[in-house]
Structure formats: structure tokens, C-alpha cells
């Protein structure tokens, strides 16, 4: 499945939950905004909470997670709130207090991620060559660590997975993780013309110029992330099933399991030549900037059952379901998103004379 621009034969996939948001209203509130206390949470917006055992007493109102006030139905819900452990509430979370810049000042930076991608405004850069992945086809052994890290499912990758953004710009993969929504609610981090996809995969890489991640954090090009949108399709995705089939083993926050090695490249689109590129940040605290983002044009298809399993299997902080774990889109603040293909050109009659507002400045850098 490819995204709709430049695709005469490929309409937008029908399985994507959520509606387009042409006004980009979902960008208005962000997790840095405090919840509006005057609006009581709707019951259907409350994350599901594990039932307490009888000896713990009945569920009290103050035990329920607080929720961002009703607004855009695609807003991330406030999934972490008051911990059952009763410790302080300073930890970061989606959709509510504490404001992320209080948690980590870099979250108030000017060049944050994710962003809304508007293909018509992307700068076509012919110098952006197809990505090359080396060593991504892993043997079954040694096994890999799959973990519920509290806000996502994360697969730790061994050394040897190499990726180049261009000549002399080499990276090695560290880990991959996913972002998703809830039943009937999409949860990708990046959006396209305001459209949010059901889910998104991030494969995080470190520049070979750095030995350790903390050295690379905040340095321009220190980290690079390959991102792809996950959409609903008619068939089960066998590559993803190798991970999703283990989710029950890591339902509890902080739990982990071992899974056989797999072909990591099979989790990404087959077309690695058409993508968007921009410089942004990590999408969770510490929100370090200087991250090179590559967002593929082609989407990856999972079955409805697989997408449901992803959004329904894990538990996060405070025994609330781990759902809607995406950050709202951040302002570009003058950044130009580059495209490796002429994304601003549309084959439909109404766009016979596309306006290409931005030119390619970086030429692949």
C-alpha cells in the first residue's frame, strides 16, 4: 500500500481508522497543555483499568486515570496518572500533566517530532537515494529481547544491522518500537495531511560516529529513525505476527520475553526508495533534537485482528491499558520536509498544475 499522492492505481487504504483532519485541529492541544479541569472526562474515554481484588477494596474515583478533556477524538488519552504503587506523579505520560517541558526542557525545542507531513509542500530532493539496509535478516538464534517498556513494545536489536543515509553517513540499528491507538482510534505519531494512521513503527539507529547513545543524543544526525505507517489490510502480516504472537507474555509493564530472530526489514515497506526526510527529535522525553527522520511513503499492512491485538494486549502505568501512545504533531517552525520523490505532483485532474513551494536545500545531507 502506498500513500495516495502520485498513485493513480492505489487509493488510500480503507482499513485506516479515524477521519481526516483537514484543519489539523488535532495539532492544537498538545501534551504540554494542562488538562482542562472544567470538563469532566467522558466515561468512554477512560482507559480500561484492571479490576482490583476484593481484599484491595472497590475501585474509587481517585484511582481512575485522569483523562484529557474531550476534544479531538484522536488526541492521546491520559494513560498514566496515579500509580497503583502510590509513588509520585512526576513521570511523563501521554495527554496530560506534567507538561513535558517541565519533565525535560528539550521538549520545548523548536524542532520537535512528530510532525504533520504535507506532501504538496515537501521539497523534492533527487539526491535522496534509496535506503540500503545490511544485516537486517537475522537468524533465529540468538533470540532477541521483546519488552513492554511501560509506554511501548520494544525489540532490542543486536549489533550488525547497518543502514546508510548517504555516503559516509552510516548508522547501526539499536531497537524498534511501535506506537498505536485503541479500538476504532488511530495512533500513528506522524500524520499525513492531518490523517492519522492506525499505528507506526520506529526503527532507531545511532550514527557510527558515536559509541554510546548518550553521546549521540542531541547531536545533529546522532540518531536516525526509520518510520513506517501501519494500516489495516485483508491478510495477516507474517513478519509482524512473529512479534505480536508474544504480546501476551509481556502484558505487564516492565515485563520481557525472548523471541526468535527475524527479518527486521520485513517489518518495513518493500519500497525503500520513496520517503520523506526531516530533522526532528525523539517523540518522548528527553525529546532530544538532531534526530534524522525517514518516513516511508509506502505503508505496511496488518490484519484487523493484528492491529486489535497490538492495541489491546499490553498494560501500562497504573494498570491502565497501554493505548494511544502517540505524541501530538509538533509545529515545523520553518523546517522543510524533503521527499525522495516528487510527492507534490498529483496525477488527478484537479492538481494538473501543482505548486512546488519548497526547493531542495540539503541535497541529501
Amino acid at each position: 500500500q502506498r500513500l495516495p499522492w502520485m498513485q493513480e492505481d492505489s487509493p488510500l487504504g480503507g482499513g485506516s481508522s479515524g477521519e481526516d483532519d483537514p484543519l489539523h485541529e488535532e495539532d492544537l492541544p498538545s501534551e504540554e497543555d494542562p488538562p482542562r479541569e472544567e470538563d469532566p472526562p467522558r466515561e468512554e474515554d477512560l482507559p480500561e483499568v484492571k479490576p482490583k481484588s476484593e481484599e484491595e477494596g472497590s475501585l474509587k474515583l481517585e484511582d481512575l486515570p485522569t483523562v484529557e478533556a474531550p476534544g479531538d477524538p484522536q488526541e492521546p488519552q491520559n494513560n498514566a496518572h496515579r500509580d497503583k504503587e502510590g509513588d509520585n506523579q512526576r513521570h511523563w505520560r501521554y495527554g496530560g500533566d506534567p507538561p513535558w517541558p517541565q519533565v525535560s526542557p528539550a521538549c520545548a525545542g523548536r524542532f520537535q517530532s512528530p510532525v504533520d507531513i504535507r506532501p504538496q509542500l515537501a521539497a523534492f530532493c533527487p539526491a535522496l537515494r534509496p535506503l540500503e539496509l545490511l544485516g537486517f535478516e537475522l537468524p533465529l538464534l540468538p533470540e532477541l529481547r521483546l519488552r513492554n517498556n511501560g509506554h511501548s513494545v520494544q525489540l532490542t536489536l543486536p549489533s550488525g544491522l547497518e543502514m546508510a543515509l548517504g555516503p559516509g553517513r552510516e548508522y547501526r540499528a539499536l531497537q524498534l518500537h511501535l506506537h498505536w491507538g485503541a479500538v476504532g482510534r488511530p495512533g500513528s505519531e506522524h500524520t499525513v495531511e492531518g490523517h492519522r494512521f492506525p499505528a507506526e513503527i520506529h526503527v532507531v539507529h545511532i550514527s557510527t560516529a558515536y559509541a554510546r547513545v548518550e553521546e549521540a543524543l542531541g547531536r545533529p544526525g546522532g540518531l536516525a529513525v526509520l518510520a513506517a505507517f501501519l494500516e489495516e489490510g485483508p491478510e495477516e502480516n507474517s513478519a509482524y505476527e512473529q512479534l505480536l504472537s508474544h504480546l501476551e507474555e509481556i502484558a505487564e509493564e516492565g515485563s520481557e520475553t525472548q523471541v526468535p530472530g527475524l527479518d527486521v526489514s520485513a517489518l518495513l515497506p518493500s519500497d525503500l526508495s520513496r520517503y520523506f526526510r526531516y530533522e526532528g527529535s525523539l517523540t518522548t522525553p528527553p525529546c532530544a533534537q538532531g534526530v534524522i527522520w525517514t518516513v516511508f511513503n509506502q505503508t505496511v499492512m496488518l490484519s484487523a485482528k493484528q492491529l486489535h491485538a497490538l492495541s489491546d494486549a499490553l498494560w501500562g502505568p497504573g494498570d491502565s491499558r497501554l493505548q494511544l501512545n502517540f505524541r501530538v504533531t509538533q509545529p515545523l517552525n520553518g523546517r522543510v520536509i524533503e521527499a525522495s520523490f516528487p510527492a507534490g505532483v498529483d496525477s488527478s485532474p484537479r492538481a494538473a498544475e501543482p505548486v512546488q513551494l519548497n526547493s531542495c536545500l540539503a541535497a541529501g545531507d
Epitope: 519533565v103 517498556n149 518500537h177 532507531v204 554510546r212 547513545v213 517523540t283 528527553p286
Partner: nanobody
Framework: QVKLEESGGDLVQPGGSLRLSCAAS????????IGWFRQAPGKEREGVSC????????YYADSVKGRFTISRDNAKNMVYLQMNSLKPEDTAIYYC??????????????????????????WGQGTQVTVSS
Amino acid sequence: QVKLEESGGDLVQPGGSLRLSCAASGFTLDYYAIGWFRQAPGKEREGVSCFSSVDGSTYYADSVKGRFTISRDNAKNMVYLQMNSLKPEDTAIYYCAAELYGELGVATVQAMCRLTTPGGDYWGQGTQVTVSS
């Protein structure tokens, strides 16, 4: 060289106090979750207390809540575990561990403290605490 090193373990009487120290060298703890873990003979390693340098959040296991306090000295790149009202069941080898915090590693301090195997980025060698009369 990148490492974590614990110190401060000792033999102490029940009801007594100890302060364990964890020194990080070769890297800064700024982007890390730091945890104190312990392993008693014949038992699984368990998370005692965890702290995030990123958002300041803390976690304490039920068995130590109200008795133990985790803290960090940014200038010295040290993490401490103040242990009061010690009990014989606190006897164990205490380990310090650090793992990247956020989407690159553990995203909550609870998740950090539930790491029962040395799968974190950095683990120390441990310091022995014995509570006995």
C-alpha cells in the same frame, strides 16, 4: 571506562541504617533511569527503588516503602540509597543499574524496577548488606 560501582554495604543490626552509593564513571546519568536491585541467597533479583534523571519520578517496592530513599547527586554523578529501619529480610547483595529512559530504553521507573535480569545498559558488581544481630 564505562561502569557503575556500588559501595557502602556492611553488617548492621536490625533497626539500623546504611547509605549505599553508586558511582557512574565514563558516562553521565542525565538520560538514564537508575535502579537499586537486590538479590538474596536462593531468591530472584528484585527491584528495590528506581529513579529517572529525566523526569525525576521514583518508584519503591512495597517492602521498602517508607524506609528507603533514593537520591542523586548530579555534580558527582552518583546515586544513593538511604536505608533506614533495616530488617533481617533486607539482607542481600545490592546492585546498581542504569538504563536509558524514554522510548530508547525503559519508559517508566516501574518498568525499570521490574527488570529482574542484568539486561540493562549498565550493571554494577554489587555490595553486600547483612542485617543481623
